[in-house]
């Protein structure tokens, strides 16, 4: 008698390894004999597809060499014209030993930056990825993390992170190891001991001492008033990545002496500078107890940056404050030629206002520091990339000894304008009352305005208070 098809062995989930055989069985009872068709993910499998073998009147489907793309839902449908067609479905789960598809590569990185060593894997079950440094498993911490992708991310790379690394991918079917790669950490040139300023008598001998470090070991050059040192003897020694340079001078005139430590990172150079003044006792006659005096700015470098007729603080710890501060600014500006066009005008404004600080006249003339928020805006908004390099080039700390030997102020040590808006100075070219900042104005006219995030207003401010708009 005619009998509608019944699937007596429903399809089950099949686990298969890549390149192995996988078989689905769909046992059917019916009369007359049914026609059996197979689908994968609802797409008909053609009888002549050479990747499959269909036998036993269609009841056995064999995948001859499983690929990772074969996973999915397989269904058999039986129909003999009696009653309706019947269907049974089962899943194919392709299992795969771990495979490292993007292995790590050798990396040279500068200390303080972020390093990422790739390690992309394949496998089913999904492999877990761990890393080995040298001969030991690598421990994750607040700086070192294995990302979801398997890559190793190291924030704020330190010298001790240098070494040999390999990644390990592991699942229940096996383990794969990457080749060993090398992480090399380079360190910006940094001055460990700065030359000290001296106030000496005419005809004295003075030895200026400068010590620097970095990876690779930096070279040290000496500059006298902006030019290569013309007289004096230099002695150098290198030990444990530290270079020590001594410049011996016969003093016949005051001068600003700068020690420049330079090392190379690929095609780029990093430099650190420290300066010392040599003043001759009779030449310098500062007023008693005063660290400096107020005067109108008469220099050239900061003409476009400082407010017109700005009263600036001149530091009498220099023999010739105007010349020395102008030279400091000049040297710093030359460094800025290589920074981005977005950063440069902002950095120039910051440097000029930091070296030639606004001056509050009175019984004791007082320099007025830049407001912290202006410094932070330059640091975080305009010069985020360059700031790290600039910090390395400056003396650590906002004030080093009794002089500003700066290139970059330490923003956190400046007063906030949220406290006392009169106790700190704004950068004249920044109109902080607007919030849709894109660029900092080039220093051409005396007072251009620009759209920049608003900072606190004060009654003594010379800037107009315009409406503020929230940033999106």
């Amino acid at each position: 008698l005619p009998k509608a098809p019944v699937i007596t062995t429903p399809l089950e989930t099949v686990d298969a390894l890549v390149e192995e055989v996988a078989t689905f069985m769909c046992a059917v009872e019916s009369y007359p004999q049914p026609e059996i068709s197979w689908t994968r993910n609802k797409i008909l499998i053609k009888l002549f597809d050479t990747r499959y073998s269909i036998r036993e009147n269609g009841q056995l489907l064999t995948i001859l060499s499983v690929e990772d793309s074969d996973d999915g839902i397989y269904c058999c449908t039986a129909n003999n014209g009696v009653g309706g067609a019947v269907e049974s479905c089962g899943a194919l789960q392709v299992k795969m030993k771990p495979k490292i598809t993007r292995p790590p590569i050798n990396v040279k990185i500068i200390e303080g930056l972020k390093a990422v060593l790739p390690c992309t894997t394949m496998g089913n079950p999904k492999p877990s990825v761990s890393w080995i440094k040298g001969d030991s498993p690598l421990r994750e911490n607040s700086r070192i993390a294995v990302l979801e992708s398997g890559s190793l991310r190291i924030h704020n790379v330190q010298k001790e992170d240098a070494g040999q690394y390999r990644c390990v991918a592991k699942n229940s079917l096996g383990t794969a190891y990457s080749k060993v790669v090398k992480l090399e950490v380079e360190v910006f040139a940094r001055i460990l001991r700065a030359p000290e300023s001296h106030n000496v008598t005419f005809g004295s001998f003075v030895t200026l001492h400068c010590t620097a470090t970095g990876i690779p070991v930096p070279t040290i050059t000496w500059i006298e008033n902006g030019n290569a040192v013309s007289s004096g003897s230099i002695q150098e020694s290198v030990k444990d990545r530290v270079i020590d340079s001594r410049l011996q001078l016969f003093i016949t005139k005051p001068g600003l002496y700068t020690c420049i430590a330079t090392n190379k990172h690929g095609e780029k150079f990093s430099t650190a500078k420290a300066a010392a003044t040599i003043s001759i006792a009779e030449w310098s006659k500062p007023q008693k107890d005063n660290k400096g005096y107020c005067a109108q700015y008469r220099g050239e470098v900061c003409n476009a940056v400082l407010a017109k007729d700005a009263l600036v603080f001149l530091n009498t710890s220099y023999a010739d404050p105007e010349e020395a501060q102008e030279l400091l600014v000049h040297t710093a500006w030359n460094e800025l030629k290589v920074v981005s066009p977005v950063c440069r005008p902002a950095a120039e404004a910051l440097l000029c206002n930091h070296i030639f600080q606004e001056c509050s006249p009175g019984v004791v003339p007082t320099p007025i520091p830049i407001c912290r928020e202006y410094c932070l805006a330059v640091k975080e908004l305009f010069c985020a990339k360059e700031w790290l390099v600039m910090e390395e080039k400056t003396h650590r700390g906002l004030y080093r000894s009794e002089m500003h030997l700066l290139s970059v102020p330490e923003c956190s040590k400046l007063p906030s304008m949220h406290w006392d808006p009169t106790a700190c100075a704004r950068l004249p070219h920044l109109d902080y009352n607007k919030e849709n900042l894109k660029t900092f104005p080039p220093m051409t006219s005396s007072k251009p305005s620009v759209d920049i995030p608003n900072l606190p207003s004060s009654s003594s401010s010379s800037f107009s208070v315009s409406p503020t708009y929230s940033m999106t």
Epitope: A377, E380, L381, S457, S470
Partner: antibody, heavy 124, light 107 residues
Framework: EVQLVESGGGLVKPGGSLRLSCAAS????????MNWVRQAPGKGLEWVSS????????YYADSVKGRFTISRDNAKNSLYLQMNSLRAEDTAVYYC?????????????????WGQGTLVTVSS | DIQMTQSPSTLSASVGDRVTITCRAS??????LAWYQQKPGKAPKLLIY???SLESGVPSRFSGSGSGTEFILTISSLQPDDFATYYC?????????FGQGTKVEIK
């Protein structure tokens, strides 16, 4: 996890002294400006004093100027408030609170974290 | 010192209500205003800074607006957890000052 824990509160007679401490953990204390804020029982909040990260800048409310001294020890992750010549009107819960800058790096977020407070009672 | 005035002092509302609290400054503070929430026996919690910037972790039903001398805190749909006292605070310049507070209670 950022934590600020005040201590040193208690009962003191008018004209007396008290020293409050605030122990900070879970952040780089030496990088942040810190504050004291107080709240009299059943009343509103009043800013008392602020100190910059390196102690270079210190500010006081007029009501406490000359009587209170704020200080910090970055090595010990601690903030202090030395209160002298105490008056009945200084009775309040004293909170220490942190200032920080938001993700832009230059917009101030005042008092983004607070301690649980310590009660100071000035009474004869 | 800059005076900060909040209104109303007390506000009765129901869950789901839209609530607005106003804060006025005695002189312009640009947008240097913060809002805090305080529950009985607890420390205040920063909700909004720079007049309209939402502090991380604060539900988006809280929003702030205004600049100069007039500011508003809005709770778009009041939740049971929102019954508390709210303070505004100016930080344009020291002395930093707070409003007297607005207590949001169940109607």
């Amino acid at each position: 996890e950022v934590q600020l824990v005040e201590s040193g509160g208690g009962l003191v007679k008018p004209g007396g002294s008290l020293r409050l401490s605030c122990a900070a953990s879970g952040f780089t204390f030496s990088s942040y400006d810190m504050n004291w804020v107080r709240q009299a029982p059943g009343k509103g909040l009043e800013w008392v004093s602020s100190i910059s990260s390196s102690s270079s800048y210190i500010y006081y409310a007029d009501s406490v100027k000359g009587r209170f001294t704020i200080s910090r020890d970055n090595a010990k992750n601690s903030l202090y408030l030395q209160m002298n010549s105490l008056r009945a009107e200084d009775t309040a819960v004293y909170y220490c609170a942190r200032d920080s800058y938001d993700s832009s790096g230059y917009y101030l977020r005042p008092f983004d974290y607070w301690g649980q407070g310590t009660l100071v009672t000035v009474s004869s | 010192d800059i005076q900060m005035t909040q209104s109303p002092s007390t506000l009765s509302a129901s869950v789901g209500d839209r609530v607005t609290i106003t804060c006025r400054a005695s002189q312009s503070i640009d947008n240097w205003l913060a809002w805090y929430q305080q529950k009985p026996g607890k420390a205040p919690k920063l909700l909004i800074y720079k007049a309209s910037s939402l502090e991380s972790g604060v539900p988006s039903r809280f929003s702030g607006s205004g600049s100069g001398t007039e500011f508003i805190l809005t709770i778009s749909s009041l939740q049971p957890d929102d019954f508390a006292t709210y303070y505004c605070q100016q930080y344009n310049s020291h002395s930093w000052t707070f409003g007297q507070g607005t207590k949001v209670e169940i109607k």
